[in-house]
């Protein structure tokens, strides 16, 4: 019967007695930077080309017994997971292996860099179809390794890496922390994060998504027909590399940004038990398990968005945090979050010719996060409209006044230390969807975009008194672009998007002693693109 | 994911290029930085990736590497250029004593230097 991991990533329409999705990634080449491999294994024979690249440190210890089967173990298994005949994800993908890890599974940053450079030179000498690079390795945070990954990604290569097996924040490791790389954590057959003894899968905002990574059946280097089960974030990354190969084979023109958004969009949502993660990491860690799209074409009409969290600002009075979108993405909204509730809001601002989302800490605050909503919006022209604090009136307002521009997000930023001591504003008057409303002492920022066929609407859900969390979701066919809270009083910890749901967190009234008149409203801006939908229908 | 100024140990050596009367001294006020792995057991001292500024050509990378070797030799230090990078990042990989880091950070075109470190199969 089909192994659990292949069943997990397969949409129901393909599920039969065996895993046979259409097009096995035949147009794509997957580079594997790992240990040596047993290329004559029946699973991968004829599918993997062993390059002459080798850059590994000497093995530790004086009594090390170098056995080919042990040296090849990790790489052979991963090659099998990506493209193995029987247990592989992308059975049609061809692979090339580079040896950057020694027989003990140890390598160096410099050896990995030289390997990445080798791939870039190969790509220049002999351009082929789409390239996927699988990096099933991790070391401590490395500026240079992250920079090399960024350069390779900007050359059109899709890089997929293991989040790391340290039960730790993936942002402390490389290449997992490189923003341009697709970073994969590991889950098991119960959709729980993988535990590896005391350690386990890494987590946090640097993880893009999770994939099967426990008891994964794959090629064993013990013999040419042997199979073995292995666990780890390497195995999880290999699944995503395989899924990426299949998506790129179906749509070879997909950019990295488009591929990442599709991987997120087609993932299983909210199936991971977040209690396994440290409390402060739960909100930052994506609750996504990778899966193949239900069909290889026809996703183009979707307006794809994802949520990007910044690093923590730190606790100093003037500390700020910045969240950035990828170069091909549009920043459609910006929000902020603070566990202590002490923050001074957020604003969208230009940096290096691109909009970024900046959140501001407040005096006595433990720090803030900036949360960017990053979307794929072709031919978009977006700008930020700002209204300074209204001071005297009931609230500050700003709207999109340019012809054809629609409101995609609202942000507010204030200089006073605690808005909670000031009178909260009235709620937005109905029937004014292109307007942001905020506290009279705050400056309000509206993200206004013009794009072919783009339409947006505002959806609100309010409750009379704060109860920890208020949510509002966009309905089927609409995509959440903006998420904010009304009012901006001190008991509101912040707002952020989780998939297509806007979440506003506040302190519970029982702990703050707030009065019931202080309503909290979650405000979602939901958009869709008629242009993308029409273009997709014309293709079919 | 992680910003470039992210969570890792950074030892910044702010240096002016006075020594050796460098012909192509970096602009006044610019400083190259030194980085190393925050996890001590994974550090590999003695091997360094010297990363040069973005638009540096291969010939300039080779010249900078040779200049480092020459200046190190004048101080009685042996160095070995293990690899010259081009195609992804301009720079070179050098085996040398950590005592030479100050000197290397003053070289023209240097953006930053990172001590080599271990990576592991996951």
């Amino acid at each position: 019967s089909i192994p659990w991991n292949l069943e997990r990533i397969t949409p129901p329409r393909y599920r039969a007695d065996e895993y046979q999705p259409p097009d096995g990634g035949s147009l794509v080449e997957v580079y594997l930077l790992d240990t040596s491999i047993q290329s004559d294994h029946r699973e991968i024979e004829g599918r993997v080309m062993v390059t002459d690249f080798e850059n590994v440190p000497e093995e530790d210890g004086t009594r090390f017994h170098r056995q080919a089967s042990k040296c090849d173990s990790h790489g052979t298994h991963l090659a099998g997971v990506v493209s193995g005949r029987d247990a592989g994800v992308a059975k049609g993908a061809s692979m090339r292996s580079l040896r950057v890890l020694n027989c003990q599974g140890k390598g160096t940053v410099s050896g990995t860099l030289i390997g990445l450079e080798f791939i870039r030179k190969s790509q220049l000498v002999q351009p082929v179809g789409p390239l996927v690079v699988l990096l099933p390795l991790a070391g401590g945070y490395s500026r240079v390794l992250n920079a090399a990954c960024q350069r390779l990604a900007r050359a059109g290569v899709v890089l997929v890496t293991a989040a790391g097996n340290f039960r730790d924040d993936a942002c402390l490791y490389s290449p997992a922390s490189a923003p341009e790389v697709i970073t994969v954590g590991a889950t098991n057959a119960q959709d729980q994060p993988v535990t590896l003894g005391t350690l386990g899968t890494n987590f946090g905002r640097c993880v893009d998504l999770f994939a099967p990574g426990e008891d994964i059946i794959g090629a064993s280097s013990d013999c040419s027909t042997c199979f073995v089960s292995q666990s780890g974030t390497s195995q999880a990354a290999a699944h995503v590399a395989g899924i990426a190969a299949m998506m790129l084979s179906a749509e070879p023109e997909l950019t990295l940004a488009e591929l990442r958004q599709r991987l997120i969009h087609f993932s299983a949502k909210d199936v991971i038990n977040e209690a396994w993660f440290p409390e402060d990491q739960r909100v930052l860690t994506p609750n996504l398990v990778a899966a193949l799209p239900p069909s290889t074409h026809g996703a183009g009409w979707q307006l794809f968005c994802r949520t990007v969290w910044s690093a923590h600002s730190g606790p100093t009075r003037m500390a700020t945090a910045i969240a950035r979108c990828a170069p091909d993405e549009e920043l459609l909204s910006c929000s902020s979050f603070s566990r202590s509730g002490k923050r001074r809001g957020e604003r969208m601002e230009a940096q290096g010719g691109k909009l970024v989302c900046r959140a501001h800490n407040a005096f006595g605050g433990e720090g803030v996060y900036a949360i960017a909503r990053c979307c794929l919006l072709p031919q978009a022209n977006c700008s930020v409209h700002t209204a300074p604090p209204a001071e005297a009136s009931m609230g500050t307002r700003v709207h999109c006044h340019q012809q054809g521009h629609v409101l995609t997000g609202c942000s507010s930023h204030w200089e006073v230390e605690d808005l909670g001591t000031h009178k909260p504003p009235v709620l937005r008057p109905r029937g004014q969807p292109n307007q942001c409303v905020g506290h009279r002492e705050a400056s309000i920022h509206a993200s206004c975009c013009h794009a072919p066929g783009l339409e947006c609407k505002v959806k609100e859900h309010g409750i009379p008194a704060p109860q920890g969390q208020v949510t509002v979701a966009c309905e089927e066919g609409w995509t959440l672009t903006g998420c904010s809270a009304l009012p901006g009083t001190s008991h509101v910890l912040g707002a952020y998007a989780v998939d297509n749901t806007c979440v506003v967190r506040s302190r519970d009234v029982s702990t703050t002693g707030s009065t019931s008149e202080e309503a909290v409203t979650a405000v979602a801006i939901c958009c869709r693109s008629r242009h993308l939908a029409q273009a997709s229908q014309e293709l079919q | 994911q992680e910003d470039e100024d992210g969570d890792y140990e950074e030892l910044v050596l702010a240096l002016r290029s006075e020594e050796d009367g460098l012909a192509e001294a970096p602009e006044h006020g610019t400083t190259a930085t030194f980085h190393r792995c925050a996890k001590d057991p994974w550090r590999l001292p003695g091997t360094y990736v010297v990363v040069l500024k973005e638009e540096t050509h291969l010939s300039q990378s080779e010249r900078t590497a040779r200049r480092l070797q020459a200046q190190a030799a004048r101080r009685g230090y042996l160095t070995k250029i293990l690899h010259v990078f081009h195609g992804l990042l301009p720079g070179f990989l050098v085996k040398m004593s950590g005592d030479l880091l100050e000197l290397a950070l003053k070289l023209p075109h240097v953006d930053y230097i990172e001590e080599d470190s271990s990576v592991f199969a996951q």
């Epitope: 210890g61 090390f64 003990q104 590896l196 003894g197 005391t198 350690l199 666990s231 | 550090r43």
Partner: antibody, heavy 122, light 111 residues
Framework: QVHLVESGGGVVQPGRSLRLSCAAS????????MHWVRQAPGKGLEWVAL????????YYADSVKGRFTISRDNSKNTLYLQMNSLRAEDTAVYYC???????????????WGQGTTVTVSS | QSVLTQPPSVSAAPGQKVTISCSGS????????VSWYQQLPGTAPKLLIY???KRPSGIPDRFSGSKSGTSATLGITGLQTGDEADYYC???????????FGTGTRVTVLQ
């Protein structure tokens, strides 16, 4: 439930041999390095030996080098310690312990057995 | 003769804080991960801290670890009678290619 159970201890004369076993259950044995640690009566912990997850490498304390051999049978989920040329100072409770990870052997030990007593006496 | 030195004993009243030092060299603590172990009377050792300052699940946050140079420290806050035990630091020693334990510290809770 993760379990390590040592066996094979007993009273033995100096110069003789003894083989200790450690049966592992509740985890994927072949994914972890394994240690032997001992504790003489009223004394502190003393590390004895380590074997890598796949059996490809072994390390020993100087005090037992050449006399003790660590080995494992991954198909039986069992760790062994062959002790030859035993001395009075080898008298101790012997614990087997799991390394925190396969590759990062310097991380220490996270699961311990209850120990088996070895007494070397004439 | 252990290469890691710990104080033989420390004591404090319930609710107080104690710290245990572990002194080594660049070949062990200076360049390798430090773990701390608790051994209650008559039982096997138990892992408290690994990677200098990380706690396995189930270990309360009253236990903390830190490292500075070639020394490591274990801190126990809110001392409880159940904390009476021997505590050992441990790390790999690159020069010896061996794992080394500290001399051990007995923690006594004063009544």
């Amino acid at each position: 439930q993760v379990h390590l159970v040592e066996s094979g201890g007993g009273v033995v004369q100096p110069g003789r041999s003894l083989r200790l076993s450690c049966a592992a259950s509740g985890f994927t044995f072949n994914s972890f390095g394994m240690h032997w640690v001992r504790q003489a009566p009223g004394k502190g912990l003393e590390w004895v030996a380590l074997i890598w997850s796949d059996g490809s490498d072994e390390y020993y304390a100087d005090s037992v080098k050449g006399r003790f051999t660590i080995s494992r049978d991954n198909s039986k989920n069992t760790l062994y310690l062959q002790m030859n040329s035993l001395r009075a100072e080898d008298t101790a409770v012997y614990y087997c312990a799991r390394a925190i990870a396969a590759l990062y052997y310097y991380y220490g030990m996270d699961v311990w057995g209850q120990g088996t007593t070895v007494t070397v006496s004439s | 003769q252990s290469v890691l030195t710990q104080p033989p004993s420390v004591s404090a009243a319930p609710g107080q804080k104690v710290t245990i030092s572990c002194s080594g060299s660049s070949s062990n603590i200076g360049n390798n991960f430090v773990s701390w172990y608790q051994q209650l009377p008559g039982t096997a050792p138990k892992l408290l801290i690994y990677d200098y300052n990380k706690r396995p699940s189930g270990i309360p946050d009253r236990f903390s670890g830190s490292k500075s140079g070639t020394s490591a420290t274990l801190g126990i806050t809110g001392l409880q009678t159940g904390d009476e035990a021997d505590y050992y630091c441990g790390t790999w020693d690159s020069s010896l290619s061996a794992y080394v334990f500290g001399t051990g510290t007995r923690v006594t809770v004063l009544q």
